[in-house]
């Protein structure tokens, strides 16, 4: 998931603040940008979120808003400041004519402006079976801890708080920020207004059909009786949660966002800020049978984004559409015909479908995990959700072909035991956005702030790529993949792991230009090899097979093509041990895999040799997958020979620490 992603319309106005003799004009050459929703029917022109630069104080925000009003008035325009943001993002919400955008973009402190847009509930009028570990039976589902230490905030429609399922479990806050309902003949009917939120509250913490029966909830109304809200209303809701958190710090917080709108830079930014304040956000991937990266908050990297599957582990179809998919989805959860509280009466139940229901399941699971281990960070929680998911059960044929490799084949499940996972070395695979087709195009995959990048690989459907490398960016390692001339674009694939007290560095060997190929090893005492990458500056690597893949006694070594530079990820962490595992196939084959054994975690995945017929390498759970061109297009047998190289690691330190806890 990446903020810079999305079929997102960006109108960049490079403006200099000369008129009005501004005292605090932006420095020469800085540009404020204007953004609007790429989906035209969802746009709400006339209302704008003016986002100010990060360090802007509330007083400066207010002054900037007043300045805009004054300058607009001088031009004969009326404006109305609807809200001044502080706590999450500095800025303000303004109702004004679009004619004033140029003026607003020239104001001091302005970072960007986003036109308001709509967000929508993601539901359409077996589940515990899927998420319950085998040793429980769904009809006697009694979780060990029902999430009692966790507070779950629900941003949704109004709810029927006296429903028997959720009575006493949900506190209705006084927060309400919803747009008017569409249509002149719309009649507000309480049961319809409360339908979506009531059902989801029931799925999270309902007495009979809830996942986390002990979790307490707080509801904020950001969706109207038609299930429609706005980005600005959602932002104000998130700000309300942050302020509540500051006023009265409680235990772990989970925020459920069962809604989706078009890609929104500002909504993603607000989610990032809240997540970095220690809040776990869970959102619906969206019900548009589309790439989740084109929607918000689904595309925010810090949010746990949930797609929907049914009782047969098929992706959910919803009319002509269905669950969203792609690299911005973290995992799937039950989202078809989910039984939950109905707002028709206080004892009624109804089944609803959608990614909202799926997200509610994951919010419930998260609440239970956090209740058992309240100190879990967002990164730790996400890794556990992935680790305990059912793997490779979704029929990927439902997804568009180009999205299958990017979409996680994971269905959320409760951990078999709430303790004892601490010994595990957790890793996940993070795909970048597609680079685009130009020669110099690159793609970057990033790990979360408290994850370690242990390896980096790349993949191109055309096979035209120039490899990948780990490089420092803003004090953190990132994985950058390079497209090649005539290529259709590349993906960078980062292997992101939880490795406490790790000290990792990258060792590079330049192209050897010798027949033996390029080699690099971890030479520092106590450092072990966790991943190998190779990058080449030539457009076409000649065929080259190193005569010796890995000399005995030198397992800490990366080997590659003589025209490539080779990068070794070398880490030192208490008790960390790693080993290299290879699977070579002499004859051409489209896919070669190698997996790590039980108790070991895949940290690195690469291919040998790095020649042009190799499309790339990537990790799927604990298996390293190397893809090659279609066999029919490959030349000689020797040219087709491919080896998948996995680096498998475990942490004896983590294992010992968890044993001491028990």
């Amino acid at each position: 998931q990446e903020d810079e992603d999305g079929d997102y319309e960006e109108l960049v106005l490079a403006l200099r603040s000369e008129e009005d003799g501004l005292a605090e004009a932006p420095e020469h050459g800085t540009t404020a940008t204007f953004h609007r929703c790429a989906k035209d029917p969802w746009r709400l022109p006339g209302t704008y979120v003016v986002v100010l630069k990060e360090e802007t104080h509330l007083s400066q925000s207010e002054r900037t808003a007043r300045r805009l009003q004054a300058q607009a008035a001088r031009r004969g325009y009326l404006t109305k400041i609807l809200h001044v943001f502080h706590g999450l993002l500095p800025g303000f919400l303004v109702k004004m004519s679009g004619d004033l955008l140029e003026l607003a973009l020239k104001l001091p402190h302005v970072d960007y402006i986003e036109e308001d847009s709509s967000v929508f509930a993601q539901s359409i009028p077996w589940n515990l079976e899927r998420i319950t570990p085998p040793r429980y039976r769904a009809d006697e589902y009694q979780p060990p801890d029902g999430g009692s230490l966790v507070e779950v905030y629900l941003l949704d429609t109004s709810i029927q708080s006296d429903h028997r399922e959720i009575e006493g479990r949900v506190m209705v806050t006084d927060f309400e920020n919803v747009p008017e309902e569409d249509g002149t003949r719309f009649h507000r009917q309480a049961s319809k207004c409360d339908s979506h939120g009531t059902h989801l509250a029931g799925v999270v913490s309902g007495r009979d059909a809830g996942v986390a029966k002990g979790a307490s909830m707080r509801s904020l109304r950001v969706l109207n009786c038609q299930g429609k809200g706005t980005v600005s209303g959602t932002l104000i809701g998130l700000e309300f949660i942050r302020k509540s958190q500051l006023v009265q710090p409680v235990g772990p917080l989970v925020v459920l966002l069962p809604l989706a709108g078009g890609y929104s830079r500002v909504l993603n930014a607000a989610c990032q800020r809240l997540a970095r304040a220690g809040v776990v956000l869970v959102t619906a991937a969206g019900n548009f049978r589309d790439d989740a990266c084109l929607y918000s908050p689904a595309s925010a990297p810090e949010v746990i984004t949930v797609g929907a599957t049914n009782a047969q582990d098929q992706p959910v179809t919803l009319g002509t559409l269905g669950t969203n998919f792609g690299r911005c989805v973290d995992l799937f959860a039950p989202g078809e015909d989910i039984i939950g509280a109905s707002s028709d009466c206080s004892t009624c139940f109804v089944s609803q479908s959608g990614t909202s229901q799926a997200a509610a399941h994951v919010a419930g699971i998260a609440a239970m995990m956090l209740s058992a281990e309240p100190e879990l960070t967002l990164a730790e929680l996400r890794q556990r959700l992935i680790h305990f998911s059912a793997k490779d059960v979704i029929n990927e044929a439902w997804f568009p072909e180009d999205q299958r490799v990017l979409t996680p084949n994971l269905v959320a499940a409760l951990p078999p035991s709430t303790h004892g996972a601490g010994w595990q070395l957790f890793c996940r695979t993070v795909w970048s956005a597609h680079s685009g087709p130009t020669r110099m195009a690159t793609a970057v995959a990033r790990c979360a702030p408290d994850e370690e990048l242990l390896s980096c690989s790349s993949f191109s459907r055309s096979g035209k790529r120039r490899g990948e490398r780990m490089e420092a960016q803003g004090g953190k390692l990132v994985c950058r993949a390079h497209n090649a001339f005539g290529g259709e674009g590349v993906y960078a694939i980062a292997r992101c792991c939880l490795l406490p007290q790790a000290n990792c560095s990258v060792h590079t060997a330049p192209p050897a230009e010798a027949s033996m190929g390029t080699r690099v090893h971890c030479h520092q005492q106590g450092h072990v090899l966790t991943g190998c990458s190779s990058h080449w500056e030539v457009e076409d690597l000649g065929t080259h097979k190193p005569p010796v893949l890995r000399p005995r006694g030198q397992p800490n070594q990366c080997v590659g093509h003589r025209e490539a530079s080779i990068h070794a990820s070398c880490c030192h962490a208490p008790g960390l041990e790693c080993k290299v595992k290879e699977h070579g196939i002499p004859a051409p084959q489209e896919q070669v895999t190698v997996a790590c054994e039980e108790g070991w975690t895949l940290t690195g995945c690469s291919a040998l040799p790095g020649t042009s017929h190799v499309l790339g390498a990537y990790a799927v759970d604990n298996t390293c997958v190397v893809r090659s061109r279609d066999v029919s297009t490959t030349g000689s047998t020797s040219e087709g020979a491919v080896t998948a190289v996995a680096i498998c690691c475990r942490s004896r330190h983590l294992a010992q620490a968890s044993q001491e806890l028990q």
Partner: antibody, heavy 117, light 108 residues
Framework: EVQLVESGGGLVQPGGSLRLSCAAS????????MHWVRQATGKGLEWVSA???????YYPGSVKGRFTISRENAKNSLYLQMNSLRAGDTAVYYC???????????WGQGTLVTVSS | EIVMTQSPATLSVSPGERATLSCRAS??????LAWYQQKPGQAPRLLIY???TRATGIPARFSGSGSGTEFTLTISSLQSEDFAVYYC??????????FGPGTKVDIK
């Protein structure tokens, strides 16, 4: 129709600076890799700099640290900021587009830079 | 960096005759080689890329061949508008992108 129009050339003293511009039309500049190539009078072609669609920049050793390539997507324009100019930088400077599967496919008409005291 | 050399420096040919221009790379550039034509006072124009693929709108009398380090541009029957300077360029190993010094084709 794809068009590239350079401007900003002229006479400058050694050690001076100049900023060349290239206005692109008929395509979206940000979707392509763009280059500057120069040619001294009666001499061959020399590649001067490139900017990738993702913003990465590249230079040969002869200009690294002195020249800066940039682009402004809103104006569909490419720039070359040239500092610490030397007599050897005197040339016609061409703005060039690189196609996705075709190398330097469109060239501007060029703008003359003369570095002389 | 890869050094490109072209031969001959000047080629004198009569209209209607065949012209063969050579380009050599100091190390293999695979098939990532292009040929450009430049007439006096004009910008260069792409003729051939990928060593042998004609660019859009280029007449069939222009053809390219070769791979690795040795390349040839052939003009099967020279027309008056073909008298110009021809440059080869490698785009396999970069940066930098390197051009040959050029071959001038003039009227015999």
């Amino acid at each position: 129709e794809v068009q590239l129009v350079e401007s900003g050339g002229g006479l400058v003293q050694p050690g001076g600076s100049l900023r060349l511009s290239c206005a692109a039309s008929g395509f979206t500049l940000s979707s392509y890799d763009m280059h500057w190539v120069r040619q001294a009078t009666g001499k061959g072609l020399e590649w001067v700099s490139a900017i990738g669609s993702t913003g990465d920049t590249y230079y040969p050793g002869s200009v690294k640290g002195r020249f800066t390539i940039s682009r402004e997507n809103a104006k569909n324009s490419l720039y070359l900021q040239m500092n610490s100019l030397r007599a050897g930088d005197t040339a016609v400077y061409y703005c060039v587009r690189e196609g996705w599967e075709v190398p330097f496919d469109y060239w501007g008409q060029g703008t003359l830079v003369t570095v002389s005291s | 960096e890869i050094v490109m050399t072209q031969s001959p420096a000047t080629l004198s040919v009569s209209p209607g005759e065949r012209a063969t221009l050579s380009c050599r790379a100091s190390q293999s550039v695979s098939s990532n080689l292009a040929w450009y034509q430049q007439k006096p006072g004009q910008a260069p124009r792409l003729l051939i890329y990928g060593a042998s693929t004609r660019a859009t709108g280029i007449p069939a009398r222009f053809s390219g061949s070769g791979s690795g380090t040795e390349f040839t541009l052939t003009i099967s029957s020279l027309q008056s508008e073909d008298f110009a300077v021809y440059y080869c360029q490698q785009y396999n190993n970069w940066p930098p992108f390197t051009f040959g010094p050029g071959t001038k084709v003039d009227i015999k």
